[in-house]
């Protein structure tokens, strides 16, 4: 009744290890860490086999076969690299998760390493079987903007790429009788959220109540440069538009709003978010240097009754920028109390512009960006959104832009965004 | 074309209530507000209050606050404004009106009346 | 509370005839933010609903007429009607739209 001398399987071993092997003696067949036992093309951890009364053994000796990690899960704007020869993806095989740069970064600075355990699943000693995100990049044009020009009104021509978080957001309010069109700017922050002024979305209504266009009536052009040739341009509709809950018409105080896009439109060259600044009351410094694009009115002889009778027949179509200093908060609240009118500068608002007057944003630039350049961590920071500005003509002197200071908002836009500031923090100004 | 037609005149007793309806058609109804206006017999015009049947948000004369509700039922097209505990001042034509004023109905008249 | 006020309370005018009717609100209807008056003009003939004649103080809304022409900012406002037809017998309504609405009491045009 003795069974015949086992062999352990390659890779593999039995146990209790024995000289000899009688009827109803049991053995269990495991394998070495990284390797599974494989019976009849089935992977277990272990095998039993038995001793039987007339000496023979009830199964064959399984196979220990080497774990296998298979293709590894694809990353969103990732790509994978194999470190091992011949794009093993066994185990101990090591692979690398990067991101689609320069356009998306790895969050949290994450190696992206990934090694194929014993248990066949990809493991990154951080994240462990998560994948990685790749989020964004903000802040970074692919084209460096020029040195800055003291001089849209007084404004140069942008090259295609300067500011590929520029969006050109058209509003057609069909439920109006007549239809009503109308145009503004905004800020790329994400793949999915652009951020704009509040009243280019609100319904131009015939009252002061304060109601955003459906949504349906929105259409976002990012990569936009000629408005003549959208042809290049991705162009996307609104699945959510968003007005701050305190928009005040009356004095455009929480002039900000946001509009999420139907799909997650794909970064390049001239589709790039730009950076959310630091939840900070102060807004920018006084005197520091900030730019604003826009396809509005760059004729600086041109009347506001001018523009508004003349719809969008005054529009540049090309991308117009300037550079404007931000005024002292006192000078500016000094200089429009000075002028008839309601004309209250909010802790909400910053200005920018020249006392001498020549350059300036004006109607059609509304929603736009300004732009401040972080030495620290060399990105471009959204600082202000174009809201509104004096009765006179745009550039005129003494009357200076003013702009929603988008640093008191911070939390909201992530909140209405529905990500928590620490998960994003490549997009926060560092 | 753009149409808004108010139910018909209506009889009631002091301390009723009554629901009048304003049924709009031809354009967005969930984008376009309704408002609603008395008018007394010889005289002007007063400001109800206006519903947005997008959301159901409603906004009120404070004088007629305790008097007026109005509602939507978006699936018709239709808006109500219910008057409650009527008393011979409530006798008047209601006109409802939407886009903004550029349309209106022909008006509903209600007489308060033992 | 906005309170609206017009005179006169009525006027009589031959038919081709220029007339102007005033309109004042107790505090400024100007919103300088828009650049926009937020005042309305309503006609309403006998018998009939009113009809929306003039929005944002100056604008003409669709198939009104040309002879009908609103002015003024902040809180003086005139309805003007250049040379009166038979058919303009009403009484004018202005009404603010800067904080809710309020009606003024009423101009009656009649012809003689």
């Known amino acids: 009744n003795e069974c015949p001398e086992l062999q352990p399987p390659v890779h593999g071993k039995i146990e209790p290890s024995q000289a000899k092997y009688f009827f109803k003696d049991q053995v269990l067949v495991s394998c070495d860490t990284g390797y599974k036992v494989l019976k009849d093309n089935v992977e277990m951890d272990t095998f039993q086999i038995e001793c039987l009364k007339d000496g023979t053994w009830s199964n064959k000796i399984p196979t220990c076969k080497i774990v296998d990690c298979r293709a590894p899960g694809e990353l969103e704007h990732g790509l994978i690299t194999f470190s091992t020869r011949n794009n093993l993806t066994t185990y101990k095989s090591e692979i690398k998760y990067s991101c689609q740069e320069p356009y998306y970064k790895m969050l949290n600075n994450n190696t992206g390493i990934y090694t194929c355990s014993a248990q066949g699943v990809w493991m990154n000693k951080v994240l462990g079987r998560s994948l990685p995100t790749c989020l964004p990049e903000c802040g970074q044009p692919s084209r460096s903007l020029p040195s800055l020009v003291k001089r849209i009104i007084g404004g140069r021509n942008a090259e295609p790429g300067l500011f590929p978080w520029q969006a050109l957001i058209v509003v057609e309010d069909t439920s109006r009788v007549p239809n009503d069109k109308w145009f503004g700017s905004g800020a790329l922050l994400s793949a999915s959220w652009i951020l704009t002024a509040a009243h280019v979305l609100r319904s131009q209504r015939r009252d002061t109540t304060v109601i955003p266009v459906s949504k349906e009536h929105v259409t976002v052009y990012l990569g936009l440069h000629d408005v003549r040739d959208k042809s290049g341009a991705v162009n996307s509709s609104a699945a959510r538009v968003v007005l701050h809950p305190d928009f005040n018409i009356q004095n455009y105080n929480h002039d900000i709003a946001l509009v999420q896009l139907q799909e997650p439109v794909p970064l390049g060259p001239h589709v790039m978010p730009v950076c959310l600044p630091r939840l900070e009351p102060e807004g920018p410094a006084p005197h520091m240097l900030g730019l604003v694009a826009g396809w509005g009115i760059s004729n600086p002889n041109v009347t506001v009754d001018e523009i508004i009778s003349s719809g969008t027949r005054t529009l540049s179509d090309v991308l117009q920028y300037v550079k404007l200093p931000v005024v002292p908060h006192a000078e500016c609240k000094t200089s429009y109390e000075s002028r008839s009118g309601n004309y209250s500068v909010t802790e909400n608002m910053f200005c920018a512009g020249y006392y001498e007057g020549g350059k300036d944003t004006c109607l059609g630039d509304s929603g736009g960006a300004f732009v401040i350049f972080d030495d620290l961590s060399q990105r471009w920071v959204v600082q202000g959104l174009v809201s509104w500005g004096g009765p006179e003509e745009c550039g005129s002197k003494q009357v200076y832009g003013v702009y929603t200071k988008v640093s008191n908002y911070v939390d909201w836009v992530w909140e209405q965004m529905g990500l928590p500031q620490s998960v994003v923090e490549p997009q926060v100004e560092r | 074309q753009v149409q808004l037609k108010q139910s018909g005149p209506e009889l009631v007793k002091p301390g009723a209530s009554v629901k009048l309806s304003c049924k709009a058609s031809?354009?967005?109804?969930?984008?376009?507000?309704i408002n609603w206006v008395k008018q007394r017999p010889g005289q002007g015009l007063e400001w109800i209050g206006w519903?947005?049947?997008?959301?159901?948000?409603?906004k009120y004369n404070e004088e007629f606050t305790d008097k007026a509700t109005l509602t939507v039922d978006v699936s018709s097209s239709t808006a109500f404004m219910e008057l409650h505990s009527l008393t011979s001042e409530d006798s008047a034509v209601y006109f409802c009106?939407?886009?903004?004023?550029?349309?209106w109905g022909q008006g509903t008249l209600v007489t308060v009346s033992s | 509370d906005i309170v609206m006020t017009q005179s006169p309370s009525s006027l009589a005018v031959s038919a081709g005839e220029k007339v102007t009717m005033s309109c004042k609100s107790s505090?400024?209807?100007?919103?300088?933010?828009?650049?926009?008056?937020?005042l309305s003009w309503y006609q309403q003939k006998p018998g009939q609903s009113p009809k929306l004649l003039i929005y944002?103080?100056?604008t003409r809304e669709s198939g009104v007429p040309d002879r009908f022409t609103g002015s003024g900012s902040g809180t003086d406002f005139t309805l003007t009607i250049s040379s009166v037809q038979a058919e303009d017998l009403a009484v004018y309504y202005c009404?603010?739209?800067?904080?809710?609405?309020?009606f003024g009491g009423g101009t009656k045009l009649e012809i003689k």
């Open positions: 009106s939407s886009v903004e004023d550029s349309y």
């Open positions: 031809g354009y967005t109804f969930t984008s376009n507000d």
């Open positions: 519903i947005y049947p997008r959301d159901g948000t409603t």
């Open positions: 505090q400024s209807l100007l919103i300088s933010r828009t650049r926009k008056n937020y």
């Open positions: 944002w103080a100056s």
């Open positions: 009404k603010q739209s800067y904080n809710l609405y309020t």
